[in-house]
């Protein structure tokens, strides 16, 4: 049986199937209090109106309470991410109550039917919370609903129906089909909890978007633009065009939200930061690495509630696996002049050298044309912590090797057969670290020699005036 939510075509088919005839009464939603990290342990099933299981199972009324809500499934068995999330929560919050909301019987349906069941499941959770609120010391402010995919919208309904306001809802790639563009009362929204944070990892502007594209929380984080996740390509997932490849890619990207959240729980010392930006393209240009006015935040469990923020879109890059943290840099390169460039688009490569480590050679992604006699901004990121930057090596090549660009290059060469050599003139590079918020200017090692031909290298060192620190501190200090 294929994994949930995939392949895309299969889900598309599901959406157009007629409603199945229900021959038996649907079983109720079950609440399993995971009293042990041991997966073999049966846990305790909580029952509305029955206080004995709460006492028998050591439900801690004053502690945080997590409700984990799974999504639609094409299988009758829990998916593997659930164990990882429960275990991570137990590790991070040792005294907390971790409750698994088992609505498999209602989720293991046609997708449209499962969607129609989200409301009733949300209502069940709300009733459980209302009952718990009658107990001494239990506070709705300590409740954190964590919903994956369709489960994120279930959490939204629960937050909407409960008497009072739950402390937090985390939406892990909330489902897109039948929720995109829906009214706020029919999907997860910022009104559903005191703080609603959302991770979007499988959004598509073309074809079927498994995850919802629109912002639905107080903060909406789009790792890697919210679409193509590193390590989830066809080659990464199976290495060959075997059966179920597309299914695996869908599962990998959709489920990445869960693993990013797990990462934030277990790798507390390696927090990932996201940066507020109006759109993905602007972020890719490197112009959104500011932490001023609460424009950056930790992702996942460590996210901080921002006052007066709603539908704030935030972006970051990540590694392909845990720990997902990368180090973001904004690079501003002023190209003073082109020499004999014809129609060739340059592609820049930098290597960063730091006190802790050196980076690999990193390509600077061109979002728009390189402008001459203008400052061009780029985003680069490294998987390792380089420490304080010491020097930068810059190289460039002609256009990327597409057939069109090869033709352009050949045409340019033929039109200028005696081309004396293409050159760019770059005198300095300004760098800002997203993680530390430090700004530095790097000057050409040889101020008399700032022209660079394709394949040649130019070295830049910290300028004499060295560390140009603005009144911006590290996000770890600044975040509320």
């Amino acid at each position: 049986s294929p994994t949930p939510f995939g392949p895309e075509g299969q889900l598309a088919d599901e959406l157009h199937k007629p409603k199945a005839i229900q021959t038996e009464v649907k079983p109720s939603v079950r609440f399993n209090l995971r009293t042990s990290k041991d997966p073999e342990h049966e846990g305790c099933y909580l029952s509305l109106g029955h206080s004995q299981p709460l006492e028998d199972c050591g439900f801690n009324m004053t502690a945080k309470t997590f409700f984990i809500i799974h999504g639609w499934t094409m299988s009758g068995i829990f998916e593997n991410w659930l164990h990882k999330l429960v275990s991570a929560l137990h590790t991070r919050e040792k005294d907390a109550n971790v409750v698994v909301v088992d609505w498999l019987p209602l989720a293991h349906q046609l997708y449209t039917d499962a969607v129609n069941n989200t409301r009733v499941v949300g209502h069940s959770i709300a009733r459980m919370l209302d009952w718990l609120q009658e107990k001494d010391d239990f506070s709705l402010g300590n409740v954190h609903l964590i919903g994956y995919s369709l489960g994120a919208h279930v959490a939204g309904y629960a937050g909407n129906f409960v008497k009072g306001t739950v402390g937090r809802i985390t939406g892990l790639d909330p489902a897109g089909p039948m929720f995109e563009g829906a009214d706020i009362h029919k999907r997860l929204s910022p009104d559903d909890a005191d703080f609603v944070d959302v991770l979007h990892t499988y959004t598509r502007s073309f074809g079927l978007s498994i995850g919802i594209q629109m912002p639905v929380g107080h903060i909406d984080i789009y790792p890697n633009g919210g679409d193509f996740q590193p390590g989830c390509g066809l080659n990464d997932v199976l290495g060959s065009m075997a059966y179920g490849t597309i299914t695996e890619v869908v599962k990998c990207e959709h489920e990445r939200a869960v693993h990013l959240f797990v990462d934030s729980l277990v790798n507390q010392d390696k927090p990932s930061f996201a940066f507020q930006c109006t759109d993905s393209n602007r972020f890719k240009k490197g112009i959104c690495l500011s932490c001023r006015k609460n424009r950056c935040n930790s992702i996942g469990y460590n996210a901080k509630k921002m006052r007066n923020k709603r539908n704030s879109k935030m972006y970051l890059k990540t590694r392909a696996g845990m720990p997902f943290r990368v180090y973001h840099y904004q690079m501003k390169i002023h190209v003073f002049s082109y020499k004999n460039m014809g129609e060739i688009e340059p592609t820049f490569y930098v290597t960063l050298y730091g006190t802790n480590a050196d980076s690999q050679t990193l390509p600077l992604e061109i979002v728009e044309r390189i402008e001459q006699n203008a400052t061009n901004t780029f985003l680069v990121y490294t998987e390792e912590d380089l420490g304080d930057l010491l020097k930068i090596q810059l190289t460039w090549e002609g256009a990327s090797q597409s057939w069109y660009n090869l033709w352009k290059e050949l045409r340019s060469y033929l039109s200028q057969p005696h081309n004396p050599g293409r050159e760019l003139n770059i005198r300095r590079i300004r760098v800002k670290s997203g993680e530390t918020q430090r700004k530095l200017t790097f000057c050409a090692e040889d101020p008399e020699n700032t022209s660079i031909s394709p394949g040649r290298e130019l070295w830049f060192r910290k300028c004499r005036d060295g560390w140009r620190m603005k009144n911006e501190t590290s996000p770890t200090v600044e975040l509320p």
Partner: antibody, heavy 119, light 107 residues
Framework: EVQLQQSGPELLKPGASVKISCKAS????????MHWVKQSHGKSLEWIGG????????TYNEKFKDKATLTVDKSSSTAYMELRSLTSEDSAVYYC????????????WGQGTTLTVSS | DIVLTQSLATLSVTPGDSVSLSCRAS??????LHWYQQKSHESPRLLIK???QSISGIPSRFSGSGSGTDFTLSINSVETEDFGMYFC?????????FGGGTKLEIK
């Protein structure tokens, strides 16, 4: 004490069908998934599929989707696997195994049911 | 499907030796790997779950390690009762799959 008691050996002709049973005791039957595993003579193990006894939801290995059907009888805490259109390739030992809460690992196994398909 | 490779089909050891059995996954499976021992004409027995979690009733000489794609089952000072087949199994994604097995035999 958790126990999984499987039905006895079967000798059947090609084309026939068989229903193997696995009676569970010592735990709450509906709280854990039940899985079925095939082991051909001298070979490794192959996961056939699993069932959630709470409501009968199943998941299958694509390879066995047209071969096996998993069911449960909650009243007797028994899981069943029916194998149809038998061929000599289906000759093997079949095990039922109790999954953990998440259905991932199998701490308890039945004693195995030997199926021989021969004309 | 995720392929689990147990590179050594047979491992010959002397009682008292310490051994390591390896299992490699064709893609990242995090810690969703379990180890089983099977003796002739017996059902498999769970030794280690989720890469490194011990099982009650299993001797402490058995331990597991690894994450991602490379996993190891270690037996500290092998005893005669430890000889038999060892299988790894992944539960990261369906279909769940088993390795081909490593036979631990007396040298």
């Amino acid at each position: 004490e958790v126990q999984l008691q499987q039905s006895g050996p079967e000798l059947l002709k090609p084309g026939a069908s068989v229903k193997i049973s696995c009676k569970a005791s010592g735990y709450t039957f509906t709280d854990y998934t039940m899985h079925w595993v095939k082991q051909s003579h001298g070979k490794s193990l192959e996961w056939i599929g699993g069932i959630n006894p709470y409501y009968g939801g199943t998941t299958y290995n694509e390879k066995f989707k047209d071969k096996a059907t998993l069911t449960v009888d909650k009243s007797s805490s028994t899981a069943y696997m029916e194998l149809r259109s038998l061929t000599s390739e289906d000759s093997a030992v079949y095990y039922c195994a109790k999954g953990d809460y998440y259905g991932g690992s199998y701490n308890y196994w039945g004693q195995g049911t030997t199926l021989t398909v021969s004309s | 499907d995720i392929v689990l490779t147990q590179s050594l089909a047979t491992l010959s050891v002397t009682p008292g030796d310490s051994v390591s059995l390896s299992c490699r996954a064709s893609q990242d499976i995090s810690n969703s790997l379990h180890w089983y021992q099977q003796k002739s004409h017996e059902s498999p027995r769970l030794l280690i779950k989720y890469a490194s979690q011990s099982i009650s009733g299993i001797p402490s000489r058995f331990s597991g390690s690894g994450s991602g794609t490379d996993f190891t089952l270690s037996i500290n000072s092998v005893e005669t009762e430890d000889f038999g087949m060892y299988f790894c199994q992944q539960s990261n994604s369906w279909p769940y799959t088993f390795g081909g097995g490593t036979k631990l035999e007396i040298k």
